[in-house]
């Protein structure tokens, strides 16, 4: 089995208030089975940004069709960026578990920061 890796290619993403930001994340394996979630921050206080299996995230859309059985692209777009959105975003793979899924591997994170306003 190829060991799963979480790839977040950008360490830093400069964004503009009011625009849409794209956060990239790809995986190198579909196994073990389990969902991919996006968080801002780390530790117990981290904020859930997107959960592929449930929830309502009105500002978040996926770049790829996650219903494809061979999908390895879990990149997301966040619309209408505000200063409150800055922080470091992590895509995290969970493996199935009972009663709760278990965190399996995290990407290295992408820091979202505000860039200069266009003149």
């Amino acid at each position: 089995e190829e060991e799963l890796q979480m790839i977040q290619p950008e360490k830093l993403l400069l964004v503009t208030v009011g625009k849409t930001a794209t956060l990239h994340c790809t995986v190198t394996s579909l196994l073990p089975v389990g969902p991919v979630l996006w968080f801002r921050g780390v530790g117990p206080g981290r904020e859930l940004i997107y959960n592929q299996k449930e929830g309502h995230f009105p500002r978040v859309t996926t770049v790829s069709d996650l219903t494809k059985r061979n999908n390895m692209d879990f990149s997301i777009r966040i619309s209408s960026i505000t200063p409150a959105d800055v922080g470091t975003y992590y895509c995290v793979k969970f493996r199935k578990g009972s009663p709760e899924n278990v965190e399996f591997k995290s990407g290295p994170g992408t820091e979202m920061a505000l860039g200069a306003k266009p003149s």
Partner: antibody, heavy 118, light 107 residues
Framework: DVQLVESGGGVVRPGESLRLSCAAS????????MSWVRQAPGKGLEWLAG????????YYIDSVKGRFTISRDNSKNSLYLQMNSLTAEDTAVYYC???????????WGLGTLVTVSS | ALTQPASVSANPGETVKITCSGG??????YGWYQQKSPGSAPVTVI????KRPSDIPSRFSGSASGSAATLTITGVRVEDEAVYFC???????????FGAGTTLTVL
Amino acid sequence: DVQLVESGGGVVRPGESLRLSCAASGFTFSSYAMSWVRQAPGKGLEWLAGISAGGSDTYYIDSVKGRFTISRDNSKNSLYLQMNSLTAEDTAVYYCARETWNHLFDYWGLGTLVTVSS
Amino acid sequence: ALTQPASVSANPGETVKITCSGGDYYSTYYGWYQQKSPGSAPVTVIHSDDKRPSDIPSRFSGSASGSAATLTITGVRVEDEAVYFCGAYDGRTYINTFGAGTTLTVL
């Protein structure tokens, strides 16, 4: 309420074709992968084919690959199964089913009966 | 292939367990589907190993470990008489499979 209603079943002769339809309502059809499952008389359930939400990716069991084609029209909230070169072994009730995020099934249609007989 | 017992029986109020083996925990999710008569629409009672749809009574529960899944009905009722199919999705092959079905008789 989620509703899936199949149609298009009937009696056909071996070698003929049939196109099944599944009309979906009560949910955002374009956000869900869908599948077709059949049940032959006195037998168990058999998954046949699945299709991604956008319709670009399709998956089949080996025994129907090249003979059956799954497709969808998200503008019509409809799922289809084109069945060619039918044989008596294709006689069954055909169900459409909505997939969960991990490709199991949460809602099923009532089914449509296909009989292949000479 | 998924293997499940052909039949199980129980008295009302008893606990029933139906097992399904043949999948790989690393790559497989399981579901359980109830069919009350042949040719009638199946009803999903468990998906994602242990997730119960909101309209399914709490006496139905599911679990998975190793290469097997288990459907448990705690306090079985006469109306639970049906054939129960286990199903699996394999993330290696992208294929869904079903067991042959278990007929539950409530005495």
